[in-house]
Interface confidence: low
């Protein structure tokens, strides 16, 4: 059955209640210089309106503080109101390493990110940090890498490993959850000149992730004890016509081309899904496409296989699909899939259909295909036009979390966290945020607060209290003692 009745119950005490933000652009200078300037000024308010320095007078200054960054203050205020336990945000690779290699490290950017993490920890909010979050036409790559063919160039994967190592080194004592790359399976939108471009770029992204994971595993895990994965875009697919076999096959094929494409090499075999490889090859044989998945060497298969500590999925909606044979040598046509918009479904302004049961089906599919592993939903949300009473978002959150709870309680899926997308909306972009672009709170915040404080949807008499374990206390308190050491 698609929908089942709501359940009452709670998520475990160690469940991560998160909120996701995309790339945080580092502030280059703390925006409160008045505390670090030792000079006294007189303001000529009636004349030239300029500040004139008073010579011979020096004031006491205080050391620079993380909260001198105006941006960080705003984020902390928003996070405090969200009452989340985790904050997922992305670093800007191009800001940290403008040259793409370690010859020019932007220390100020790293200081800014360290401030975001450490100030969050003071509020009891842990960070899940994404190293690479391509969101725009120039892909968020350092410019020299972009102009050297970006992800079509295998050396970009090596450059990524060096960047990841720098971040682990600089932030890893405070960050215990890492995402290397956000939605590499969606870069097909950009590398779409041909299927071979798409599959070539994807191959280099997989290698980049694996190199970073292996570096962490070898060099940083022993002391930092964190976990590393990558986030896959993971919408569910349903046959448009459940009575048509070809639609069922199309739905499974969508999942193979969208999720298994990256999950199979990393979680399971070290190679691309056999179904995907065979489907592309059969189209090639029939002259319908000149695409081919890269052939992996034994060394590459060994490099890729097993390089994840948990499964991270970004899930927003369910797509209705049907089979349609398409000619052409691009990823989109290689799949032979057509999407149908079901106008009877509740949808958002960007036409995201609200289909809560899809997330439960997805979680079961992942466990069935890749085994019983820790799963985090690292982004999930909907755009809602309302600037104050965002009812669609409240409905979406309530219903989707219900289905995640069913997956946990009934299906016994090892779901470890849910990260709502996103903290604040951006000007002239679809409104996914809990806060407006000028930082006004929406009513969905209270709704999410209530779910978090209840740890789900408890029976009326059940307690939402969790006993603070020794381990948890140590995580936050000792961390600060270590931090404060001279």
């Amino acid at each position: 059955k698609e929908s089942t009745p709501d359940v009452q119950g709670q998520f475990p005490c160690d469940f991560s209640w998160g909120v996701t933000e995309s790339v945080l652009k580092p502030e280059s200078v703390a925006s409160s210089p008045q505390f670090s300037d030792p000079h006294l000024y007189v303001w000529n308010a009636t004349g030239n309106r300029l500040l004139h320095r008073v010579e011979g007078v020096r004031l006491k200054t205080r050391p620079a503080q993380c909260t001198d960054f105006v941006n960080i203050k705003k984020q902390l205020e928003m996070l405090a109101r969200m009452k989340v336990t985790h904050y997922r945000f992305a670093l800007d690779w191009a800001s940290v390493l403008p040259t793409g290699n370690l010859s020019a490290v932007n220390r100020q950017a790293l200081r800014y990110y360290r401030c975001v993490v450490s100030e969050g920890l003071k509020l009891g909010i842990s960070a899940m940090v994404t190293l690479y979050y391509p969101t725009h036409a120039h892909l968020g790559l350092p410019e020299p890498l972009l102009h050297a063919d970006g992800w079509l160039n295998p050396s970009t994967a090596e450059a990524f490993q060096a960047y990841a190592g720098l971040c682990f080194q600089e932030l890893g004592d405070l960050v215990k959850l890492w995402i290397t790359i956000n939605e590499p399976n969606r870069l097909s939108d950009i590398y779409n000149r041909s299927g071979n471009d798409t599959y070539g770029a994807a191959h280099n992204l997989l290698v980049a992730h694996a190199l970073a994971w292996r570096l962490y595993d070898r060099q940083f895990r022993p002391s930092q004890r964190g976990a590393v994965s990558l986030s896959l875009h993971a919408d569910w697919a349903e046959p448009a016509n459940p009575y048509a076999d070809s639609h069922w096959r199309a739905a499974e094929r969508f999942l193979q081309f969208e999720i298994a494409w990256f999950a199979e090499p990393l979680f399971k075999t070290g190679d691309y899904p056999a179904a995907m490889r065979e489907y592309i090859a059969s189209k090639h044989r029939r002259g319908l496409s000149s695409s081919a998945l890269p052939r992996l060497t034994e060394a590459e298969r060994r490099l890729l296989k097993g390089t994840v500590d948990f499964c991270a999925l970004n899930h927003f909606t369910t797509r209705f699909v049907m089979h349609e044979q398409l000619a052409g040598s691009r990823y989109d046509s290689d799949r032979d899939i057509q999407f149908l918009q079901d106008i009877t479904r509740l949808s958002s302004p960007t036409r995201l259909a609200v289909i809560p049961w899809g997330v439960r089906k997805l979680l079961r599919w992942v466990r069935r295909n890749y085994g019983d592993m820790d799963i985090y939903i690292t982004a999930s949300g909907i755009d809602d036009q309302a600037l104050e009473d965002d009812r669609l978002r409240k409905y979406y959150l309530g219903k989707y979390l219900q289905e995640v709870l069913k997956a946990y309680l009934i299906d016994k899926v090892r779901i470890k966290g849910y990260y709502a997308f996103k903290l604040a909306e951006e000007k002239s972009k679809p409104r996914f945020g809990f806060f407006t672009s000028d930082f006004k709170a929406k009513s969905s915040i209270q709704f999410y607060n209530k779910v978090i404080s209840s740890r789900g949807f408890p029976f009326e008499n059940s307690s939402s209290r969790c006993s603070q374990t020794q381990e948890n206390t140590e995580c936050t308190v000792c961390l600060f003692l270590v931090q404060k050491k001279p």
Epitope: P98, T99, N101, S103, A104, E143, H147, A148
Partner: antibody, heavy 120, light 108 residues
Amino acid sequence: QIQLQQSGAELMKPGASVRMSCKASGYTFSSYWIEWVKQRSGHGLEWIGEIFPGGGSTIYNENFRDKATFTADTSSNTAYMQLSSLTSEDSAVYFCARRGYYDAAWFDYWGQGTLVTVSA
Amino acid sequence: QIVLTQSPAIMSASPGERVTLTCSASSSLSSSYLYWYQQKPGSSPKLWIYGASNLASGVPGRFSGSGSGTSYSLTISSMEAEDAASYFCHQWSSYPLTFGSGTKLELK
């Protein structure tokens, strides 16, 4: 301190080619773009293109694609621009400049310029 | 390509006078990628303003820059003799990179 030192003035015949140099010092040469800019007497500035010495990537203004060729030698910290099939229209001062990235993509250091005169 | 149009082409100003130079872009660009350079005869251009409104190191405080979208300006609050020079706006919002035709500022 950071400097870009350009080669001396050139007097060339129409149809010939000229190669000018731009030697960088005081910073990591391979880590910044080198820009080339043309300025004809009494005219404004015209961007010719850029080279990233670290990987040899080049980007040309379409108007100069068949005219200019950029190269860089990281062992001597020197960038070169060759202009081919010279005509009187190519008589100008040519500047090299260093460029930063993304939100610091301005030309922060300039060479003193190389004057090229094309005359029969 | 983005065409930058500067006006006026030439202007004269007396010492102490307030001067405004304008730069108009043929299509909207991010102010982060709009720069101004000063050039004196026989010299190379010098970065003067970056990100539309930030003064480069060593630029006197009487200079200021503003603007967004397609319209930008450079202002001198009180003209001084050393400000006589040519000023070029420049964009890095899209390729090819382009410069304005320049404004020559003379001392009256």
